[in-house]
Amino acid sequence: WELTILHTNDVHSRLEQTSEDSSKCVNASRCMGGVARLFTKVQQIRRAEPNVLLLDAGDQYQGTIWFTVYKGAEVAHFMNALRYDAMALGNHEFDNGVEGLIEPLLKEAKFPILSANIKAKGPLASQISGLYLPYKVLPVGDEVVGIVGYTSKETPFLSNPGTNLVFEDEITALQPEVDKLKTLNVNKIIALGHSGFETDKLIAQKVRGVDVVVGGHSNTFLYTGNPPSKEVPAGKYPFIVTSDDGRKVPVVQAYAFGKYLGYLKIEFDERGNVISSHGNPILLNSSIPEDPSIKADINKWRIKLDNYSTQELGKTIVYLDGSSQSCRFRECNMGNLICDAMINNNLRHADEMFWNHVSMCILNGGGIRSPIDERNNGTITWENLAAVLPFGGTFDLVQLKGSTLKKAFEHSVHRYGQSTGEFLQVGGIHVVYDLSRKPGDRVVKLDVLCTKCRVPSYDPLKMDEIYKVILPNFLANGGDGFQMIKDELLRHDSGDQDINVVSTYISKMKVIYPAVEGRIKFS
């Protein structure tokens, strides 16, 4: 019996087609992805093949103005329109709190939303009961397939799930649910979830009875053969893991942003064992037409976005200096504003020992593309912020050793004075440079804000200590020459859309007046 698994993950509100790098579509003839194009391909496959499941491995939420405005209603609407069969909860589904998940998505989705390792407690337990499930048995033709969900246990540090959801260890939580499916005579089981490729592989290895793992979170691109676009494969598709009980378990993921549709064909024997698995992600490029009906619906929903982008978010009573003359040479107040917003967006009261789990931010000055003049009645709009942060990136959470941070700050000024983009703006960091010293030895003082303290204060950076830092995904991926970050990072979790982080902060503060306050000094 053959099953076709179509899968997406980390779509991050890319409802419209995008450029090849998943930013805003500029030249339509070369654009990719989007739900209208995805629908065309899904329908093509549904028409051609008998047993098809369309699955999503989480993080539909967060990433463009679509999410900012529609807050998840767009996800439910268009996933319903595409007739998804199941979705696993990702960490970003909690970005607007539990209410921001329940109302727009859980209550409106026609498909089951899954996670076996999220347990509700207290008053939330009855409110959310039945709205998401640990697993769902799906009929497919004359057979049944069990889908069991999972979500990153790091979600409390990455999003806003509140205090009434407990995120258990994935493997510990999955095993009893898989065992339950087995007792229900379900012998074909897919683990669908959002914890990253390393955890996906562990699930394939450790959870007895899981036949296939469909993952997300790490934006992993797998491919067999010559890849069709710019993404470099992290391994073959499917990636085969040998389980502890000797089975070959296919593990898949489909990069991110709706650029690809994962396509996996699994052949099962009559006892539900995987006999063979093959496939590849399908690049959703312009050779696949956008479905006219879905496209018309997208255009209808778009109208509200255009109205939103000109509305006032808040006011500034000072000039927000985002000029390259400032931000690529010295501390600039636009850099301070953005870093403060980044930290504010990551406030999660961890426990009594820590005032927060992260206190530091770094931001390449070259990523700040425009100032905002306060003389326009102080008004700040989404449109203004889109000029400052035009690349559609995210502000991510990484873990780095102190020694890596030191290298990053050396790189920040290794060719100072040439108006290059790698000069770092900061938050929760005091750095002093001596430009008279040779490149690679210019950082003379580097103090960082403590987290394990009740009164935050600055302490010298320790080379062997592991620190959490918020930074643009561009830097996490080694952009602007920060190869040491990419090579040496110990953990990387993708965060919220850059503009959204800053706009939320401005809306919250109502009136802003960031200063230049001595975060970056030259001796």
Partner: antibody, heavy 121, light 107 residues
């Protein structure tokens, strides 16, 4: 092969009740949504009810809502339609039809031969 | 409710003719449309689903097209066994609704 066989039709007085059955074979009944569709003499097709594969949801058009109840017995591979408060306009051939394997609305790939229901005093 | 309007309500054609039947939805239904054939005193038979997919066992002279609100059923070369009534049906949302039917008669 796949088969749907309706029974239970007949002549009934207005206001009375009737229960139709649809016995199925040749496929995994519990995996499919099942529908009733009717056709009044000389008229077109009208959808009457659906029950999802697991019995979790049932939908009806306004014309029969509150009077007709669709149900299923997965252990017997049988679909039912309980028709109460029958009216003259319910006179039709009633077909049982197989839908899809999900909770989304679907088309009908297999139809029964139909059973005639006449509501007349 | 979504109204389905079929046209024409009847047509006369000869064997070998190309026949086109149209179906219009009162609102967008994407490609969630099916076509059925019904002969007198018989149950309907599924021809096409998802606007353009041929049900297995249906001759390739039948084809469907369209998306959104406007759909077409085409019989490329009418055969004697094709004289029947044809219905479209939307399954975008409940309640499911049918078109009024198109009767294809022998000229």
């Amino acid at each position: 092969q796949v088969q749907l066989v309706e029974s239970g039709g007949g002549v009934v007085q207005p206001g009375r009740s009737l229960r139709l059955s649809c016995a199925t074979s040749g496929f995994t009944f519990s995996n499919y949504g099942m529908h009733w569709v009717r056709q009044a003499p000389g008229k077109g097709l009208e959808w009457v009810a659906v029950i999802l594969y697991d019995g979790s949801n049932k939908y009806y058009p306004d014309s029969v809502k509150g009077r007709f109840t669709i149900s299923r017995d997965n252990s017997k591979n049988t679909l039912y339609l309980q028709m109460n408060s029958l009216r003259a306009e319910d006179t039709a051939v009633y077909y049982c039809a197989r839908g899809g394997s999900s909770w989304y609305p679907d088309s009908f790939d297999i139809w029964g031969q139909g059973t005639m229901v006449t509501v007349s005093s | 409710d979504i109204q389905m309007t079929q046209s024409p309500s009847s047509l006369s054609a000869s064997v070998g003719d190309r026949v086109t039947i149209t179906c219009r939805a009162s609102q967008g239904i994407s490609s969630w449309l099916a076509w059925y054939q019904q002969k007198p005193e018989k149950a309907p038979k599924s021809l096409i689903y998802a606007a353009s997919s041929l049900q297995s066992g249906v001759p390739s002279r039948f084809s469907g097209s369209g998306s959104g609100t406007d759909f077409t059923l085409t019989i490329s070369s009418l055969q004697p066994e094709d004289f029947a009534t044809y219905y479209c049906q939307q399954y975008n949302s409940y309640p499911l609704t049918f078109g009024g039917g198109t009767k294809v008669e022998i000229k």
